[in-house]
């Protein structure tokens, strides 16, 4: 008789999850020689230890602390790019602007990007059938707690001018319920961070509105200002042109781009 298994509302663990994490770790250490001495098997053991045999609705930041001990990777604190609802462009940007880093450019972010995982209470099995959905099941699930933990630490590490890329096509350009709005904004350290600079990315080709005047951006400005951090905002009217100018800043048509 098959053992009863909890059915969750979200998709199950990404297939070949252990192999994927291990392979990503090895690839990362090859791409980033400053991490060449990292033992990826130990990284996987710590990752696994955070959620295996634990109830997937009862995961805490404490469960990830052994793994977080690896998170002392030295990303330049003044070269951090946060993003909300516009991951692909943010990653395209840091692939070109090699001295800036999103969370997914760090080892831990790189390992987990776009993956889902969960275990089962009291068994060493990984659940490939279903995992808890943040809204329908519980917020303290392995994936959500992981991203909350690494996002908090990433924001805490930031200094000087911090940039954030926001999606100007969404009804809420700044969303208080996003990871950026609920975690990162509140964990920037005012004694280290001088300015948060928002880059609002326009979607429509003919969209010439000043989205920095959007009510949600004003709300973000208010939250940041109350935390004694300066706020600035720039419209990126043509993201394709923006990326092109990052690649070729000497292009004469790029004077007005960041």
């Amino acid at each position: 008789v098959p053992r009863w298994r909890q059915q969750w509302s979200g998709p199950g663990t990404t297939k070949r999850f252990p192999e994927t994490v291990l392979a990503r770790c090895v690839k990362y250490t090859e791409i980033h020689p400053e991490m060449r001495h990292v033992d990826c098997q130990s990284v996987w053991d710590a990752f696994k230890g955070a959620f295996i045999s634990k109830h997937p609705c009862n995961i805490t930041e404490e469960d990830y602390q052994p793994l977080m001990k690896l998170g002392t990777q030295t990303v330049p604190c003044n070269k951090i790019l946060l993003w909300s609802r516009i991951k692909d462009l943010a990653h395209q940007f840091t692939q070109v602007q090699r001295d800036m880093f999103t969370l997914e450019d760090t080892l831990l972010g790189y390992l987990a990007d776009d993956l889902t995982w969960c275990g089962e209470f009291n068994t060493s099995k990984i659940n490939y059938q279903s995992c808890p959905d943040w809204r329908k099941d519980c917020s303290n699930n392995p994936v959500s707690v992981f991203w909350k933990t690494v996002s908090r630490r990433f924001a805490e590490a930031a200094c000087d001018v911090v940039h954030v890329m926001l999606n100007g096509s969404r009804s809420k350009i700044f969303d208080k319920n996003s990871t950026f709005g609920s975690v990162e904004v509140h964990n920037l350290q005012p004694e280290k961070v001088q300015t948060l600079e928002a880059w609002v990315i326009h979607g429509g080709r003919e969209d010439s509105r000043d989205l920095c005047q959007d009510p949600t951006i004003k709300e973000l400005e208010s939250i940041i200002s109350k935390r004694n951090i300066q706020f600035s905002c720039k419209n990126i009217y043509r993201p394709d042109k923006f990326l092109q100018c990052v690649k070729n800043p000497e292009d004469s048509s790029c004077t007005s781009e960041i």
């Epitope: 020689p33 400053e34 060449r36 001495h37 990292v38 001990k69 690896l70």
Partner: antibody
Framework: QVQLVESGGGLVKPGGSLRLSCAAS????????MSWIRQAPGKGLEWVAS????????YYADSVRGRFTISRDNAKNSLYLQMNSLRAEDTAVYYC???????????WGQGTLVTVSS | QSVLTQPPSASGTSGQRVTISCSGS????????VYWYQHLPGTAPKLLIY???QRPSGVPDRFSGSKSGNSASLAISGLRSEDEADYYC???????????FGSGTKVTVL
């Protein structure tokens, strides 16, 4: 075969300076991280500093940070260690080492003796 | 005081097996590769083990390395007189942003 030959050691007074060199051959010098490791008389091995390949990033032991500077000249296949504000406790044999792809010190020079004494 | 802890000495008769321990923490051995070096007085140190348990070519298979958690060990089986030397473990340490060595273990063949 890989060869690492250190030079520049000698006797120096406390507070003085010395520049060590390491001539490398037998491998593509510019591709590899390089390090200095030392051994004080009767003591164990102690890592001193490392320098990355490519656009150089430098790493230092707390005991030498701010006093020693590691650098490299890929055109000359040479590694250097500029040692300032020397102290008696810096007395040691200084080894130049090549790092492997997993961070191990694969090849070592024979060492050069630095004595700091008045 | 070394960051990695090794016994100061170890000994065995010819042909015996000797094990040297190396104890650290999550900031060094826990998440990083362990390396072992053999050092004979007056010569350059020699790499014996890298990536916890890998032997460079030319190192006899009498030497083996292992790692578990925050500790590592080096085993020398079939001890020979030429194995008399100082042995050092090493690893990268995140909190120091540099390499750390053990204090060294002197192996004597009785």
């Amino acid at each position: 075969q890989v060869q690492l030959v250190e030079s520049g050691g000698g006797l120096v007074k406390p507070g003085g300076s010395l520049r060590l060199s390491c001539a490398a051959s037998g491998f593509t010098f510019s591709d590899d991280y390089m390090s200095w490791i030392r051994q004080a008389p009767g003591k164990g091995l102690e890592w001193v500093a490392s320098v990355s390949s490519g656009r150089p990033t430098t790493y230092y032991a707390d005991s030498v940070r701010g006093r020693f500077t590691i650098s490299r000249d890929n055109a000359k296949n040479s590694l250097y260690l500029q040692m300032n504000s020397l102290r008696a406790e810096d007395t040691a044999v200084y080894y130049c080492a090549r790092e492997g792809w997993s961070g191990e010190f694969t090849d070592w020079g024979q060492g050069t003796l630095v004595t700091v004494s008045s | 005081q070394s960051v990695l802890t090794q016994p100061p000495s170890a000994s065995g008769t010819s042909g015996q097996r000797v094990t040297i321990s190396c104890s650290g923490s999550s900031s060094n051995i826990g998440f990083h590769f362990v390396y072992w070096y053999q050092h004979l007085p007056g010569t350059a140190p020699k790499l014996l083990i890298y990536k916890n348990n890998q032997r460079p070519s030319g190192v006899p298979d009498r030497f083996s390395g292992s790692k578990s958690g925050n500790s590592a060990s080096l085993a020398i089986s079939g001890l020979r007189s030429e194995d008399e030397a100082d042995y050092y473990c090493a690893a990268w340490d995140d909190s120091l942003s540099g390499y750390v060595f053990g204090s060294g273990t002197k192996v004597t063949v009785l």
